[in-house]
Interface confidence: medium
Amino acid sequence: MAVTACQGLGFVVSLIGIAGIIAATCMDQWSTQDLYNNPVTAVFNYQGLWRSCVRESSGFTECRGYFTLLGLPAMLQAVRALMIVGIVLGAIGLLVSIFALKCIRIGSMEDSAKANMTLTSGIMFIVSGLCAIAGVSVFANMLVTNFWMSTANMYTGMGGMVQTVQTRYTFGAALFVGWVAGGLTLIGGVMMCIACRGLAPEETNYKAVSYHASGHSVAYKPGGFKASTGFGSNTKNKKIYDGGARTEDEVQSYPSKHDYV
């Protein structure tokens, strides 16, 4: 019961997280114009990954895609890529985890298969969450760097024309949505991985027992025999002797290496 709850909760948390990652990626408020020293500005500017918006004091808002001849900066492209990879991995993870849910029966799918699918989706959610957190953090780092560089230009009088035209940008709502969503997806993934342990078939090794037959001194030792008596989780007695059968610990032991670029 606890396993089902953990798996279900992991799925719901990841679902909310991925919805948040999608929302953050689509939002326009990744960076907002810093209004310090200019609280009564008639125009408020905010920017997203895909377009820039201007909101006038009248309430009129106009958004348009980036006009650029040079091509967008590599760092922005990298953030876009990280967010999209996060969404794609998360979506695939959700699809896999739906079939892995213990409360959903699909044909004669075994618990071992559901355990593997749960682990796969869990890893996908973890990577998805990390991608989102990384993307948002890279963007935030660029904003912080530029913010202080702009401040230096403003107050030192350096930079010539930069002093008069530079607009400082600070964190927009999308960054916080992205961090929270990435964190939720990550937590959901961890919960799915934890649930995977409980889903793995419990294969009890019975200890060797000596049976003394009357009138004979023959000892029968079925040591190492896997339980196939109907006790425990594997009542169907399928693939219990299969060389590919794994214990709970073995299911957990797959190495997973994810390289981030």
């Epitope: 960076s31 980036y66 006009f67 040079l70 967008l72 953030v79 530029n146 010539g160």
Partner: nanobody, 119 residues
């Protein structure tokens, strides 16, 4: 304050030529300079642009007829328009793009100059 000042607009007959010029005031060293145009009731569109590296970009509708050139020393960008058509009638805007360390290029616009192609 950085300003872009356009000149050279006016009335011209179809098939005629016109040269638009844009001068950037202030110590502006732009990464890219371009000409955009906006016809009545339409969105602003790129006509021609040139990056600091010298690569050019033209709208399909003006290829072979318009030529963009830059003078880095004088900080100007010119647009030579030949074989003008009535559909070229629009307000032409000068644009300068500068990278200042953020994700986005800072974009500066001129006030625009009207080009009317009519017989």
């Amino acid at each position: 304050q950085v300003q872009l000042v356009e000149s050279g607009g006016g009335l011209v007959q179809p098939g005629g030529s016109l040269r638009l010029s844009c001068a950037a005031s202030g110590e502006i060293s732009s990464d890219a300079m371009a000409w955009y145009r906006q016809a009545p009731g339409k969105q602003r569109e790129l006509v021609a642009g040139m990056t600091r590296g010298g690569s050019t970009n033209y709208a399909d509708s003006v290829k072979g007829r318009f030529t963009i050139s830059r003078d880095f020393a004088k900080n100007t960008v010119d647009l030579q328009m030949n074989s003008l058509k009535p559909e070229d009638t629009a307000v032409y805007y000068c644009n300068a793009e500068i990278y200042t360390g953020t994700f986005y290029p800072r974009s500066y616009w001129g006030q625009g100059t009207l080009v009317t192609v009519s017989s």
